[in-house]
């Protein structure tokens, strides 16, 4: 079942799927000046069996001015730089979902691919959020959103992430220096804060993730 909406937008944050559930579609979009080859696929589809998942179909772009160039090559480094990516730049990468059964990895780029990828997610898909450069999270750890089916309708859970702007220089004379805090997800104690909204963090993925103080409990 496809998710009706896109994952929620969080101010000053981007999201990224670590892997894509079977049934996910990726539009074959080409950059300006290029178009899909005539008999080319409209989208790639994550398909598979119990042991292996992969992307069906290949996206191919050709110059709008040319009729028959269908060459498919890996982009050169400068072309790759041009692609808009929401890859997380964090040492706190969640567990590699791509190794999970029923999931596909990020498809490799294709020549003259559009700068932004358009995915059509399915129920059960999880995406992770991270603050963009220049902003910092109020709470620790990855915030995530999951596409769920409730009462016959799909909805994305709300990630608990607040990204704040440039740090205020707030140390006064005599104030102790802030503690350094180790990276990585903390172990949960007896309960989890609802820090599942703007002011928080949430859910548990494998043993490395923790949920918000109350949030998990709430959903």
């Amino acid at each position: 079942e496809l998710c009706d909406d896109d994952p929620p937008e969080i101010p000053h944050a981007t999201f990224k799927a670590m892997a894509y559930k079977e049934g996910t579609m990726l539009n074959c979009e080409c950059k300006r000046g290029f178009r899909r080859i005539k008999s080319g696929s409209l989208y790639m589809l994550c398909t598979g069996n119990s042991s292996h998942s992969s992307w069906d179909n290949q996206c191919q772009c050709t110059s709008s001015a040319t009729r028959n160039t269908t060459k498919q090559v890996t982009p050169q480094p400068e072309e790759q730089k041009e692609r808009k990516t929401t890859e997380m730049q964090s040492p706190m990468q969640p567990v590699d979902q791509a190794s999970l059964p029923g999931h596909c990895r990020e498809p490799p780029p294709w020549e003259n691919e559009a700068t932004e990828r358009i995915y059509h997610f399915v129920v059960g898909q999880m995406v992770y959020y991270q603050c963009v450069q220049g902003y910092r999270a109020l709470h620790r750890g990855p915030a995530e959103s999951v596409c769920k089916m409730t009462h016959g309708k799909t909805r994305w859970t709300q990630p608990q992430l607040i990204c704040t702007g440039e740090m205020e220089t707030s140390q006064f004379p005599g104030e102790e220096k802030p503690q350094a805090s180790p990276e990585g997800r903390p172990e949960s104690e007896t309960s989890c804060l609802v820090t599942t909204t703007d002011f928080q963090i949430q859910t548990e993925m494998a043993a490395t993730m923790e949920t918000s103080i109350f949030t998990t409990e709430y959903q």
Partner: antibody, heavy 114, light 111 residues
């Protein structure tokens, strides 16, 4: 069970100082941003200050900037608010709150009066 | 002056449906930040009632619901009961203050 217990409130003269503490338990304190929120008698809620999970950044309401300092000790699961140059208008119940804030302590009363 | 605007009072009879509004600006609700609602019974600390616009913490009856649109939000209470008599506050993060902002509170009276 999540618990936040404030202490350190009391009666103080204008211009004086107080240090509030908030002892946290029942959750991973070092993972959450923490807030101080106050409520003057018969009035609404007013945010005072926030500190990130690791103490690396702090923000203050304009009404307390330069006078109050928020800090935390993650090894002791404790949040602090150092209040200097106190004024009559700082009289309020001060709540420590975690996360959204989704969880609140019961509050400690600070009275500034001569 | 509160950053978020709420009506100071609201009332209803048992069984009725009551709605409380909360209006913000482009630096808080309108910037895409979630709205949270708190209930404060007399003499007690605030309690989270609705988070992330329309989610209920466990233990909160489904008579309480929230919604958000543009720069405003609302809290609806259906099947009003006498124990719902309390002060209700909305809150949202404000990117210009780098902190949460609260509404002035709405005193709900059950007639």
């Amino acid at each position: 069970e999540v618990q936040l217990l404030e202490s350190g409130g009391g009666l103080v003269q204008p211009g004086g100082s107080l240090r509030l503490s908030c002892a946290a338990s029942g959750f991973t304190f070092s993972s959450y941003g923490m807030h101080w929120v106050r409520q003057a008698p018969g009035k609404g809620l007013e945010w005072v200050s926030v500190i990130s999970y690791d103490g690396s950044y702090k923000y203050y309401a304009d009404s307390v900037k330069g006078r109050f300092t928020i800090s935390r000790d993650n090894s002791k699961n404790t949040l602090y608010l150092q209040m200097n140059s106190l004024r009559a208008e700082d009289t309020a119940v001060y709540y420590c709150a975690a996360g959204v804030p989704d969880y609140w302590g019961q509050g400690t009363l600070v009275t500034v009066s001569s | 002056q509160s950053v978020l605007t709420q009506p100071p009072s609201a009332s209803g009879t048992p069984g009725q449906r009551v709605t409380i509004s909360c209006t913000g600006s482009s630096s808080n609700i309108g910037a895409g930040y979630d709205v949270h609602w708190y209930q404060q019974l007399p003499g007690t600390a605030p309690k989270l009632l609705i988070y992330s616009n329309n989610e209920r913490p466990s233990g909160v009856p489904d008579r309480f619901s929230g919604s958000k649109s543009g720069t405003s939000a609302s809290l609806a209470i259906s099947g009003l009961r006498s124990e719902d008599e309390a002060d209700y506050y909305c809150a949202a993060w404000d990117q210009s203050l780098n902190g949460p902002v609260f509404g002035g509170g709405t005193k709900l009276t059950v007639l």
